[in-house]
């Protein structure tokens, strides 16, 4: 049975030309994490492997940096990245989990956090 | 088409080294993993490690640790495995294998789907 | 480190049977298991990987199933080229082979 809880940073929004942090978190379970996947909608953009460690997409390579811990740093961000982004946790022996943020960049510096929510 | 090639036979003496190299082609050898089977004569598989060809980042079976070393020369799509200190028990075909997966399929690398040819290396005094 | 224990060990078939083997793990591992074939002196080929997805090429007699602990590749009718032996993989960390069935001519 799946017990765990995927925590992220929710919905967000960010300003064009800067920087955001897409941060999942996996609770609640012993389960073990063999690869984190991160998509936005169905392009991937970097996979963290247990053994292997990160691997950024060659198409965002300029732009997406691994980290802090499972997380994604995007970077020179414009509007076209404004979207649906999915971390995907894959464990074993519970499967798999998905965490889901919805990012907003702004062309003004109105820019603000929202809150954290958690998906079952 | 898509094929791992292996170096030839040795022959090393206890105490020594070997390095097997595995020569890639026929697909983009930065997007996927090399990993490294053994197999001693007559016995089963045995898992001895990988080696992400993106990123150079290894992982070894922990009764291997200290004495092999994976690595890759991107340039010339060659992944090499050395094994160092060898014993007797160490004599065994060595395998290389490319994962099932690409790094960007997203799906979960694990499975191996293309295998050299197999290096028979002899350790004996 | 997750044991890997196949059984059995070796069986004798005709060809035309249906072949069934059994690979236990011994703590579950999802459906992290993959299923390698191997001729004498020829390197494993991969039929089944994810537990139950038949790798390209591989012919559709090939089968697998289970999830957890306990996993099956099954054969449906034994082809002369499918003597040979069959070992399964577990690909959570460290990954490690069961030790292999043996599948003889009767």
């Known amino acids: 049975m799946m017990t765990g809880t995927i925590e992220t940073t929710g919905n967000i929004s960010a300003e064009k030309g800067g920087s955001i942090i897409l941060q999942c978190h996996l609770s609640s379970t012993t389960a073990q994490v063999t690869q984190v996947n991160w998509e936005q909608q169905d392009q991937l953009l970097a996979i963290c492997n247990a053994d292997l460690g990160w691997h950024i997409s060659p198409s965002f390579k300029d732009r997406v940096a691994p980290g802090p811990g499972l997380g994604l740093t995007l970077q020179s961000l414009t509007v076209n990245d404004t979207g649906e982004y999915f971390c995907i946790y894959h464990t074993y022996p519970d499967g798999t989990y998905t965490g889901r943020i919805f990012l907003e960049v702004l062309e003004s510096s109105v820019a603000e956090h929202g809150a954290r929510f958690q998906i079952p | 088409q898509v094929q791992l090639v292996q170096s030839g036979a040795e022959v090393k003496k206890p105490g020594a080294s070997v390095k097997v190299s595995c020569k890639a082609s026929g697909y983009t050898f930065t997007s996927y993993a090399i990993a490294w089977v053994r197999q001693a004569p007559g016995q089963g598989l045995e898992w001895m490690g990988w080696?992400?060809?993106?990123?150079?980042?290894?992982n070894y079976a922990q009764k291997l640790q200290g004495r092999v070393t994976m690595t890759t020369d991107t340039s010339t799509s060659t992944a090499y495995m050395e094994l160092r200190s060898l014993r007797s028990d160490d004599t065994a075909v060595y395998y290389c294998a490319r994962s099932g997966s690409s790094f960007w399929s997203g799906d979960v690398l694990g499975a191996f789907d293309i295998w050299g040819q197999g290096t028979m290396v002899t350790v004996s005094s | 480190d997750i044991q890997m224990t196949q059984s059995p060990s070796s069986l004798s078939a005709s060809v035309g049977d249906r072949v069934t083997i059994t690979c236990r793990a011994s703590?579950?591992?999802?459906?992290?298991l993959n299923w390698y074939q191997q001729k004498p002196g020829k390197a494993p080929k991969l039929l089944i990987y994810a537990a139950s997805s038949l790798q390209s090429g591989v012919p559709s007699r090939f089968s697998g199933s289970g999830s957890g602990t306990d996993f099956t590749l099954t054969i449906s009718s034994l082809q002369p080229e499918d003597f040979a032996t069959y070992y399964c993989?577990?690909?959570?960390?460290?990954?490690?082979f069961g030790g292999g069935t043996k599948v003889e001519i009767k």
């Open positions: 080696i992400s060809a993106y990123n150079g980042n290894t």
């Open positions: 703590q579950s591992i999802s459906s992290y």
């Open positions: 993989q577990q690909s959570v960390p460290p990954r490690t």
